[in-house]
């Protein structure tokens, strides 16, 4: 399966939208930095079959969608930007789902690596716990926004490697 060029463009647009979402100066939030333990190894893409890598990317985007779909999120971010954000994430989820369907029967390995999916879910659980502990403060959301932007940048690298694998 070829991830369409539109998927790469959508990923870039997602990052641009997130960059515009900031409401307060991040300089006031330095002391709120937190180690969420981004699962770098799940995005290195070396040990994965293609279908498994796609399922990890899908899980990350799905979890991001869930995180920013909460009422706490809606109360924090600009509604117009959030709607654009949802649209781009939805587009990426559709692309990845279509890709996963094409991979059925192509590879001998399972379509998803359950351990990797769980690792990604636990990563987002840590982010949610942090927001809860910080009472969804503006700075906590700024830190989370920066973290998600970073994880999207790193996942874009995996997508690029997948494209080169064709």
């Amino acid at each position: 399966c070829d991830l369409p060029q539109t998927h790469s463009l959508s990923n870039r647009r997602t990052l641009m939208i997130m960059a515009q979402m900031g409401r307060i100066s991040p300089f006031s939030c330095l002391k709120d930095r937190h180690d969420f333990g981004f699962p770098q190894e799940e995005f290195d893409g070396n040990q994965f079959q293609k279908a498994q890598a796609i399922s990890v990317l899908h899980e990350m985007i799905q979890q991001t969608f869930n995180l920013f779909s909460t009422k706490d999120s809606s109360a924090t971010w600009d509604e117009t930007l959030l709607d654009k954000f949802y649209t781009e994430l939805y587009q990426q989820l559709n692309d990845l789902e279509a890709c996963m369907m094409q991979e059925v029967g192509v590879e001998d390995t399972p379509l998803m690596n359950v351990d990797s999916i769980l690792t990604v879910r636990k990563y987002f659980q840590r982010i949610t716990l942090y927001l809860t502990e910080k009472k969804y403060s503006p700075c906590a959301w700024e830190v989370v926004r920066a973290e998600i932007m970073r994880s999207f940048s790193l996942s874009a690298n995996l997508q690029e490697r997948l494209r080169r694998k064709e």
Epitope: P26, H34, E147
Partner: antibody
Framework: EVQLVQSGAEVKKPGESLKISCKGS????????IGWVRQMPGKGLEWMGI????????AYSPSFQGQVTISADKSISTAYLQWSSLKASDTAMYYC??????????????WGQGTLVTVSS | DIQMTQSPSSLSASVGDRVTITCRAS??????LNWYQQKPGKAPKLLIY???SLQSGVPSRFSGSGSGTDFTLTISSLQPEDFATYYC?????????FGQGTKVEIK
């Protein structure tokens, strides 16, 4: 390969203006902040200020607020430090360094080679 | 502003010695402390970040510890290339501040 390349040494007279630069390459320039650090001859390191190149938001040390201006042009991945009226006490080595912003990652992990500014009449 | 105080300001040691440099913050900075090495005419180099994380490419003889207000940089066995000036820096809040430096000289 991540690199921060600074502009060359400058010799200026008191009262003159100056703008030095720091060009980033090998990474996403807007994903990191750029900080500026002063080192006067034979002295220690002093943090001057920082910029987020994605939106040009800045923060300054109180000691340098109003004395210098930090700016950036993300289209050419370059940050700047400028003076409108130099003093002899501005004579120093100036370093730029990248900072991960709010991400949990190493602070000031890459530095420019430094720009020596000499102000003398 | 958060003041950072290093001690000693200079020390003399021999190759193979264990060297310890301390840094004290004027208020709690959790673990938001970095250590840098600087050699004459060169830019500083990051050694340790977040108090105890070893920066990629830095030899394992360097280690950092501490949290709150008191921090330590340890060089387990001093090598000839380690003679330099070392700075601590807090990254807890703006304005970022550095210690005054510790010069490690050859005995």
């Amino acid at each position: 390969e991540v690199q921060l390349v600074q502009s060359g040494a400058e010799v200026k007279k008191p009262g003159e203006s100056l703008k030095i630069s720091c060009k980033g390459s090998g990474y996403s320039f807007t994903s990191y902040w750029i900080g500026w650090v002063r080192q006067m001859p034979g002295k220690g390191l002093e943090w001057m200020g920082i910029i987020d190149p994605s939106d040009s938001d800045t923060a300054y040390s109180p000691s340098f607020q109003g004395q210098v201006t930090i700016s950036a042009d993300k289209s050419i991945s370059t940050a700047y430090l400028q003076w409108s009226s130099l003093k002899a006490s501005d004579t120093a080595m100036y370093y730029c360094a990248r900072h991960p912003g709010l991400n949990w990652a190493p602070d000031f992990d890459y530095w420019g080679q430094g720009t020596l500014v000499t102000v003398s009449s | 502003d958060i003041q950072m105080t290093q001690s000693p300001s200079s020390l003399s040691a021999s190759v193979g010695d264990r060297v310890t440099i301390t840094c004290r913050a004027s208020q709690s900075i959790d673990g938001a402390l970095n250590w840098y090495q600087q050699k004459p005419g060169k830019a500083p180099k990051l050694l340790i970040y977040f108090a105890s994380s070893l920066q990629s490419g830095v030899p394992s003889r360097f280690s950092g510890s501490g949290s709150g207000t008191d921090f330590t940089l340890t060089i387990s066995s001093l090598q000839p290339e380690d003679f330099a000036t070392y700075y601590c820096q807090q990254s807890f809040d703006f304005p970022l501040t550095f210690g005054q430096g510790t010069k490690v000289e050859i005995k």
